[in-house]
């Protein structure tokens, strides 16, 4: 080993070196949180970049760059360090037009903390391992969601556009003439029935067990879907999103109530099956795989 390499190894294995890097990262993070940083922080920024460059140089000199098994670039954690330094110099010395987009990559510096704190390294390692192991479960989940999204598409396509429409029109008005002029929220409130405090028109259905309209109103299929058009089963992608929402139980009871009001109470069977299979079974299967991966990583 050359004297330079010996010195580099000594620095690298020293606990003070790890402490210095950790303090640098944390200080850097504090500086990154500043809203309107003063001008002198520019020099501090250069100092941080210098320390990170020094750290990487020490690692490269001690371990080698990329040829050989335990060299600098063979460790994925060092890829992060390398990217951080490359972007630091890129944003500083190369004129790339929209620099603000590249500045976003400064946030990666905060991730350097992971490689320095051993406990964090284990957790993140477990997380990465679990993602690898999750591939099969994810395929199963996507498959199940797709199947149910297709069923939902067949059962409920267009149903959430059913609304209670006013039974009194001007002489020159017909359903289609109104459909073509509906634009503002005011227009909608003029022709459709709204429950107090509701941002969407009251949903209804054409089957006997679906929601009925109050007196003076008739159920029609007009306008957009509820929740600014985001809640529907009109296309596969929207149906998939709705099913994902059921699986994650994200305000799912609202979707359940909307759909049952528009389609009929019989369809609660669909929701029971989806909640049991998607929410209870698949979610817990995912958690089990993550737990197993973490256990393996700890051992």
């Amino acid at each position: 080993f050359s004297p330079l390499r010996r010195i580099s190894i000594k620095i690298l294995v020293h606990s003070l070196f790890s402490m210095l890097i950790m303090c640098t990262i944390l200080t850097n993070c504090i500086f990154m949180t500043m809203n309107n940083p003063p001008d002198w922080t520019k020099n501090v920024e250069y100092t941080f970049t210098g320390i990170y460059t020094f750290e990487s140089l020490v690692k490269i000199l001690a371990r080698g760059f990329c040829v050989g098994e335990f060299t600098f670039l063979r460790d994925p954690w060092n890829w992060l360090d390398f990217v951080v330094i490359v972007f630091a110099y890129l944003t500083e010395f190369v004129n790339l037009g929209n620099v603000s987009a590249l500045r976003t990559f400064r946030v990666l510096r905060a991730l350097k903390t992971i490689s320095v704190i051993p406990g964090l390294k284990t957790i993140v390692g477990a997380l990465i391992q679990s993602v690898k192991k999750l591939s099969d479960v994810m395929i199963l989940t996507v498959f199940c969601l797709s199947v149910f999204a297709l069923i939902g598409l067949q059962l409920f396509m267009g149903n959430l556009k059913h609304k209670c429409f006013r039974n009194s029109l001007e002489n020159n008005e017909t359903l289609e003439s109104i459909m073509n002029t509906l634009e503002s929220e005011e227009d909608f409130r003029k022709y459709f029935y709204y429950l107090e405090g509701s941002k969407d028109a009251l949903l209804c259905g054409f089957s006997t067990d679906s929601g009925q309209c109050p007196e003076g109103y008739t159920c029609v299929k007009i306008g957009r879907n509820p929740d600014y058009g985001y809640t529907s089963f009109d296309t596969f992608s929207w149906a998939f999103l709705a099913l994902f929402r059921l699986m994650t139980q994200d305000y799912w009871e609202n979707l359940y109530q909307q759909t049952l009001r528009a389609a009929g109470k019989t369809y609660m069977i669909f929701f029971v099956v989806v909640i049991f299979l998607g929410s209870f079974y698949l979610i817990n299967l995912i958690l089990a795989v993550v737990a197993m991966a973490y256990e393996e990583q700890n051992q």
Epitope: G158, H162, N167, S168, L175, E176, F206, G216
Partner: nanobody, 124 residues
Framework: EVQLVESGGGVVQPGGSLRLSCAAS?????????TGWYRRAPGKQRELVAR???????QYADSVKGRFTISRDNAKKTVYLQMNSLRPEDTALYYC?????????????????WGQGTLVTVSS
Amino acid sequence: EVQLVESGGGVVQPGGSLRLSCAASHRQFIRDVFTGWYRRAPGKQRELVARIYNEGNTQYADSVKGRFTISRDNAKKTVYLQMNSLRPEDTALYYCLFSGTISTGREYRSGDYWGQGTLVTVSS
């Protein structure tokens, strides 16, 4: 194909009567907001004559109030227009309009569904 069948048109003398009927020939007509009669006189635009909402309330054009009566038979899915005291200016092609929701088997569709029209001529 959505079909509304109008009948009852013909030639009548001023002061005479006619009864027009409009039948929804298909079970795909689910629910109407209203079913109405419109007319288009030669050289004029189509205008509302009368309409009946699904709850039974009616609406008439000022020119026919007191002379024309609109009614419906839900069991037969038919709407009638009883026209009394007919005048020459009532001469027109009378159209039936179902404004509501139909079922295509796969989905529901709301809109205006027009008949082919039946000609009413009032002349001496």
